[in-house]
């Protein structure tokens, strides 16, 4: 079956990193510089992505895979495959169309990206405030006052490495 298919379509034999060159009797030709083919049987090679300006190269283009970009310091990736770089703000700020803006009282942002969010209202979930909120941190809710009997202690677990708003790079 494989032999039959290749007789019908010689291009199916061309591996990744090459293309089926119609100008040369459908011979498998290597992808030219600054281009790639990530799958076999391709009739053209794709142009490599170039990481320019605020983008920087995370992974160089090869004959079989596209370049990957990330952002220069002070910016973070947005969109599929880091299609955009967005300005970082400080914790306690949010990025608006007019630039970075401090969070209003009663809101926080513990990221360099994203919005200022209202502090959690612990009482709505039947809990009490253990630690007050700041511009950079949400309140910490604990058990409701009724749950805190003598001898009971409330332990706040350590924060995980990544908070919402950070995309894996």
């Amino acid at each position: 079956f494989e032999r039959t298919r290749s007789l019908q379509d010689p291009c199916s034999n061309c591996p990744a990193g090459t293309f089926c060159d119609n100008n040369r009797n459908q011979i498998c030709s290597p992808c030219p510089p600054n281009s790639f083919s990530s799958a076999g049987g391709q009739r053209t090679c794709d142009i490599c992505r170039q990481c320019k300006g605020v983008f920087r190269t995370r992974k160089e283009c090869s004959s079989t895979s596209n370049a990957e970009c990330d952002c220069t310091p002070g910016f973070h990736c947005l969109g599929a495959g880091c299609s955009m770089c967005e300005q970082d703000c400080k914790q306690g700020q949010e990025l608006t169309k007019k630039g970075c803006k401090d969070c209003c009282f009663g809101t926080f942002n513990d990221q360099k990206r994203g919005i200022c969010r209202p502090w959690t209202n612990c009482s709505l979930d039947g809990k009490s405030v253990l630690v007050n909120g700041t511009k950079e941190r949400d309140v910490v809710c604990g058990p409701s006052p009724a749950d805190l009997s003598p001898g009971a202690s409330s332990v706040t677990p350590p924060a995980p490495a990544r908070e919402p708003g950070h995309s894996p790079q």
């Epitope: 947005l78 969109g79 967005e86 990025l95 608006t96 169309k97 007019k98 209003c104 809101t107 990206r113 994203g114 919005i115 209202p118 959690t120 209202n121 709505l124 979930d125 949400d138 309140v139 910490v140 809710c141 924060a159 995980p160 990544r162 908070e163 919402p164 708003g165 950070h166 995309s167 894996p168």
Partner: antibody, heavy 120, light 106 residues
């Protein structure tokens, strides 16, 4: 493949409570806020609230405060929305949706929806 | 609380351009996101941050936002674009959706 899979349809009596689940796969649940949005038959989208899966911090739309509780179990990569004191007007499709990364808060992936019918 | 106003319905012939508006006080200062919802399906994000397209969304979908109006534009409309479209913003403590616009392809 990023996916949010919700629990099945529910029929409840007025005054009862319902708890809908939303299991996340294909991404690190701790990294993204989870929202709940509902849609009554023939009506538009109505935001209910969010949870920070990392800390458990929540924010609820004023309309639902006191009746809705959003929780999560990160070990099971699952978020929950419980709505109490149900009335007929709560008949709706309930969606979970992952918050994206755009400026100003977008919802980039949605569950398939859970129909909750409140009827005596 | 912040309100977003959309026309209930918009009709367009195949191949033509559809424009769906979303009105709000000084909406140009906010980031607007647009969702497409087909009958019996969950919403799908088609435009974020006023004018950016998620991967997989055709280039025919575009957005703009200034002053008191944001606009979703669908060029070369196809029968498969028939759906409800919702705009959405974040306003200080809540997520706000427009009432939705039903796009009919004639």
């Amino acid at each position: 493949q990023m996916q949010l899979v919700q629990s099945g349809a529910e029929v409840k009596k007025p005054g009862a409570s319902v708890k809908v689940s939303c299991k996340a796969s294909g991404y690190q649940m701790r990294g993204y806020y989870m929202h709940w949005v509902r849609q009554a038959p023939g009506q538009g989208l109505e935001w209910m609230g969010w949870i920070n899966p990392n800390s458990g911090g929540t924010n609820y739309a004023q309309k639902f405060q006191g009746r809705v509780t959003i929780t999560r179990d990160t070990s099971a990569s699952t978020a929950y929305m419980e709505l109490s004191s149900l009335r007929s007007e709560d008949t709706a499709v309930y969606y979970c949706a992952r918050e994206g990364e755009a400026v100003g808060l977008d919802l980039d992936y949605w569950g398939q929806g859970t129909l909750v019918t409140v009827s005596s | 609380s912040y309100e977003l106003t959309q026309p209930p319905s918009v009709s367009v012939a195949p191949g033509k351009t559809a424009r769906i508006t979303c009105g709000g006080n000084n909406i140009g200062s906010k980031s607007v996101h647009w969702y497409q919802q087909k009958p019996g399906q969950a919403p799908v994000l088609v435009i974020y941050y006023d004018s950016d397209r998620p991967s997989g969304i055709p280039e025919r979908f575009s957005g703009s936002n200034s002053g008191n109006t944001a606009t979703l534009t669908i060029s070369r409309v196809e029968a498969g674009d028939e759906a409800d479209y919702y705009c959405q913003v974040w306003d200080s403590s809540s997520v706000v959706f427009g009432g939705g616009t039903q796009l009919t392809v004639l």
